[in-house]
Amino acid sequence: SPVPPSTALKELIEELVNITQNQKAPLCNGSMVWSINLTAGVYCAALESLINVSGCSAIEKTQRMLNGFCPHKVSAGQFSSLRVRDTKIEVAQFVKDLLVHLKKLFREGQFN
């Protein structure tokens, strides 16, 4: 049976928590990604940013989970209108910011 949206979001949050708590060396070797606007279309925007990070096993599960939330196909190099113009941040900071936002969505009951 399909996973309820609340469960899917909670699983994504748990995965991001695991990433931030288990981080020893710099996440994804300190790779930089485009910062995104967290106010709308967060799942697709996050995927569009993170999909450009390759060879980083620590975030592969996150990428797969975000893919399940995003209704359209996302490919590397895709430009997002939700990208914060010309601002790049480390993957570790991106994950922390995304986690804070998703936890707020969960607490508000916004599961879709």
Partner: antibody
Framework: EVTLRESGPGLVKPTQTLTLTCTLY??????????VDWIRQPPGKGLEWLAH???????RYNPALKSRLTISKDTSKNQVVLKLTSVDPVDTATYYC???????????????WGQGTLVTVSS | DIQMTQSPSSLSASVGDRVTISCRAS??????LNWYQQKPGKAPKLLIF???KLHSGVPSRFSGSGSGTDYTLTISSLQPEDIATYYC?????????FGGGTKVEIK
């Protein structure tokens, strides 16, 4: 030391509004990841969750009572207030407030409880 | 809403006995299961959160286990001060819901 203390009217008449206050000691509701819940327990019965408020003013209610409940906080007084409108004798219960901390995963586990305040609804 | 069913509703055991209380959820709660102890006339106290994590100050004779829909609270050696009603609570989905309680008495 973390302590919560409920205060209320004790006796309320049917159709009136019940106002309960929870005063927090040893922690602040302005601190990230802190939340406060209200739970009630009718005499000799089990526990029923009523409402929750997070440090950033996100509020959630039990759908069965949502239309009658309002939860709010006064950070300056370190208090959380619950209002229950149109009370009925079936609302007679001990009302508890409790703290929830969500560090990392969102647990919804109430780690410290107040002593409770008994509210009787009767004319 | 998720229904939480506890069994037994009451039990009587001797000091030193191993006591087991069961809690079943109407759907998978993914280990977001908490246990509380309530003594007569007192507020509930958190014993165990997230299925098996002991809250600070709780004696090690209390333990929790389970997954999916089925969870267990175990008291390895019952003590006189353990006389209380025990409640399970799911913390996975709002509204938060509690089991009906298990009253533990000494034989």
């Amino acid at each position: 030391e973390v302590t919560l203390r409920e205060s209320g009217p004790g006796l309320v008449k049917p159709t009136q509004t019940l106002t309960l206050t929870c005063t927090l000691y040893g922690f602040s509701l302005s601190t990230s990841d802190m939340g406060v819940d209200w739970i009630r327990q009718p005499p000799g019965k089990g526990l029923e969750w009523l409402a929750h408020i997070w440090w950033d003013d996100v509020k959630r209610y039990n759908p069965a009572l949502k239309s009658r409940l309002t939860i709010s906080k006064d950070t300056s007084k370190n208090q959380v207030v619950l209002k229950l409108t149109s009370v009925d004798p079936v609302d007679t219960a001990t009302y508890y407030c409790a703290r929830t901390v969500s560090s990392g995963y969102i647990y919804y586990a109430m780690d410290y409880w107040g002593q409770g305040t008994l509210v009787t609804v009767s004319s | 809403d998720i229904q939480m069913t506890q069994s037994p509703s009451s039990l009587s055991a001797s000091v030193g006995d191993r006591v087991t209380i069961s809690c079943r959820a109407s759907q998978d709660i993914r280990n977001y299961l908490n246990w509380y102890q309530q003594k007569p006339g007192k507020a509930p106290k958190l014993l165990i959160f997230y299925t098996s994590k002991l809250h600070s100050g709780v004696p090690s004779r209390f333990s929790g286990s389970g997954s999916g829909t089925d969870y267990t609270l175990t008291i390895s050696s019952l003590q006189p001060e353990d006389i209380a009603t025990y409640y399970c609570q799911q913390g996975n989905t709002l509204p938060l819901t509690f089991g009906g309680g298990t009253k533990v008495e000494i034989k």
